[in-house]
C-alpha cells in the first residue's frame, strides 16, 4: 500500500510541477520593471522568454514577440533551451509513469517492468526539475547582474542623445513559479525512485547464500526469508520463500541486492 501511495503521490507532485514549468515558460512576467526608487511612470514594463510587454495605466497592454533568433542574448537562448528540455523530459516522464503506476493494469506487464519504468520516470522528473531550476536561476542571475549595471544615472538612447533613464528590471512572478515547479518536479522524481525500490519483484532478488557450518549445514538467510536446514531440497537454486500472494508491504520487506556483501 505504501509503495502505491508513494508512487501515486510522486506522480501527482510531478504532474503539478511540470504543469508549473510549462506555465512559467509561457508566462510574460520573467522580469518586471523595478518601481522602487524610480520616477512614477504611467507605464509598466515586463518581459518573458518569448515577448516583452508594456501595460499602460489606461489598461491597454501591448506585447511584442522577439521575432529575431540570432539577435537574442545567448543566456536567454540557454534559458529557453533548459526550460524546453525540462518540459520535454517531464512530459515523457509523465507518459512513462502513467504505465508504471501500480494501480493501473496493462495486460500482463510484470512488476519488474513497472519498477524499471518507475525508476526511468523518476530520473526523468529529477532531470526535468533540475533543468527548470537551472533555467530560472540563470535568468535570475542575469537580472541581478543587469540590475546593478543599470543605475539611475545611466542613460541610453538613439545616438546617445535621447535622455532615457534606463528601465531596471527585477524578479517577475514566473521566476518564483519556475523555482517552486522545478522543486516539486524534483521531489516527485525522488518519490518515484523511492517507490521503484519497493516495486522491485521477488524474481530480481538474490537467492539465499549457503554457508557450510562446522557441525551441520545451515543456509543463512537474512530476515524475511524462511530458514531452511540442510541442503536437501534447496541445493538446486530453487526459491526458498513461499511464492504465494503477498501484500505490497510484505514485498517491500524483501532484501535488495544491497543487503548482500
Amino acid at each position: 500500500m505504501a509503495v502505491t501511495a508513494c508512487q501515486g503521490l510522486g506522480f501527482v507532485v510531478s504532474l503539478i510541477g511540470i504543469a508549473g514549468i510549462i506555465a512559467a515558460t509561457c508566462m510574460d512576467q520573467w522580469s518586471t520593471q523595478d518601481l522602487y526608487n524610480n520616477p512614477v511612470t504611467a507605464v509598466f514594463n515586463y518581459q518573458g522568454l518569448w515577448r516583452s510587454c508594456v501595460r499602460e495605466s489606461s489598461g491597454f497592454t501591448e506585447c511584442r514577440g522577439y521575432f529575431t533568433l540570432l539577435g537574442l542574448p545567448a543566456m536567454l537562448q540557454a534559458v529557453r533551451a533548459l526550460m524546453i528540455v525540462g518540459i520535454v523530459l517531464g512530459a515523457i516522464g509523465l507518459l512513462v509513469s502513467i504505465f508504471a503506476l501500480k494501480c493501473i493494469r496493462i495486460g500482463s506487464m510484470e512488476d519488474s517492468a513497472k519498477a524499471n519504468m518507475t525508476l526511468t520516470s523518476g530520473i526523468m522528473f529529477i532531470v526535468s526539475g533540475l533543468c527548470a531550476i537551472a533555467g530560472v536561476s540563470v535568468f535570475a542571475n542575469m537580472l541581478v547582474t543587469n540590475f546593478w549595471m543599470s543605475t539611475a544615472n545611466m542613460y541610453t538612447g538613439m545616438g546617445g542623445m535621447v535622455q532615457t533613464v534606463q528601465t531596471r528590471y527585477t524578479f517577475g512572478a514566473a521566476l518564483f513559479v519556475g523555482w517552486v515547479a522545478g522543486g516539486l518536479t524534483l521531489i516527485g522524481g525522488v518519490m518515484m525512485c523511492i517507490a521503484c525500490r519497493g516495486l522491485a519483484p521477488e524474481e530480481t532478488n538474490y537467492k539465499a547464500v549457503s554457508y557450510h557450518a562446522s557441525g551441520h549445514s545451515v543456509a543463512y538467510k537474512p530476515g524475511g526469508f524462511k530458514a531452511s536446514t540442510g541442503f536437501g531440497s534447496n541445493t538446486k537454486n530453487k526459491k526458498i520463500y513461499d511464492g504465494g500472494a503477498r501484500t505490497e508491504d510484505e514485498v517491500q520487506s524483501y532484501p535488495s541486492k544491497h543487503d548482500y556483501v
Epitope: 520593471q33 520616477p39 512614477v40 511612470t41 504611467a42 507605464v43 514594463n45 515586463y46 518581459q47 516583452s52 510587454c53 508594456v54 499602460e56 495605466s57 489606461s58 489598461g59 491597454f60 501591448e62 511584442r64 541610453t156 538612447g157 535621447v162 535622455q163 532615457t164 533613464v165 534606463q166 528601465t167
Partner: antibody, heavy 117, light 113 residues
Framework: QVQLKESGPGLVAPSQSLSITCTVS????????VSWVRQPPGKGLEWLGV???????NYQSALRSRLSIRKDTSKSQVFLKLNSVHTDGTATYYC???????????WGQGISVIVSS | DIVMTQSPSSLTVTARERVSMTCKSS????????????LTWYQQKPGQPPKLLIY???TRESGVPDRFTGSGSGTDFTLTISSVQAEDLAIYFC?????????FGSGTKLEIK
Amino acid sequence: QVQLKESGPGLVAPSQSLSITCTVSGFSLINYGVSWVRQPPGKGLEWLGVIWGDGNTNYQSALRSRLSIRKDTSKSQVFLKLNSVHTDGTATYYCAKVGRGNAMDHWGQGISVIVSS
Amino acid sequence: DIVMTQSPSSLTVTARERVSMTCKSSQSLFNSGNQRNYLTWYQQKPGQPPKLLIYWSSTRESGVPDRFTGSGSGTDFTLTISSVQAEDLAIYFCQNNYYYPFTFGSGTKLEIK
C-alpha cells in the same frame, strides 16, 4: 457612442468645497480611466488628476492635499472634489476618458465654475 | 514635475501653407519597453473642449485628417500640418503621458491670415 457630461454648481464661495460629477455612457468605468482637466478663462489646460479602471488615483502635485477623485461604477459616475477653493479655481472643468497611450480620447463639454463670494 | 515647453506661442499662416510647431519635455518620454514616446497632441477650437489628434507622438487618432503628422523622440517633438485649412484655426497643446502628473504645454495658437 462614448459620452461624458459634467454637472455641478456654477458658483462656489472661496474656502468652500467644489464638487463636480461626471456621468459617462458608452464605456465601462471598470475598464477605462477618467481624467479631470481644468482651463482658467483665456489660459491653457491644467491636468488635475485621474482615476483608473482599477480604482487607483493620481493627482497633480500642487493639489494632492485638497483634491480627491472617486467613482461609482454601478452608476457610471466619477466625482471630483476640491477642498478650500481659491479664486484661481475659476475655470472650465472637463472630464475625459483615457485611452491608448494614456491619452484623453473623449472629452465632456465642460462645466464653467466661478469661485466668488 | 515634467515641464512641457511649446514654441512658438502663436503662429499666423496662410491657407494651404505647411506649418510646424514644437514641444520639448524636461525629461525623455521614451519607453524602451515598447519603443514608444508618450507624447500627445490636442487641438482646441474656440468655445470647444480639446480634441485628441495624435498619441504615442506619431499615431494619428481615428478620424483625424492625414495632413496632421506627429514626429520626434525622447524630449523633442513636432506637430506638422502639411496644408493648413481654415478649420485648423485652434490652440494646439502637447501633453506628457509618461510621468505623473500628466503635464500640458502652454499651447501654440494657430491663426489664419
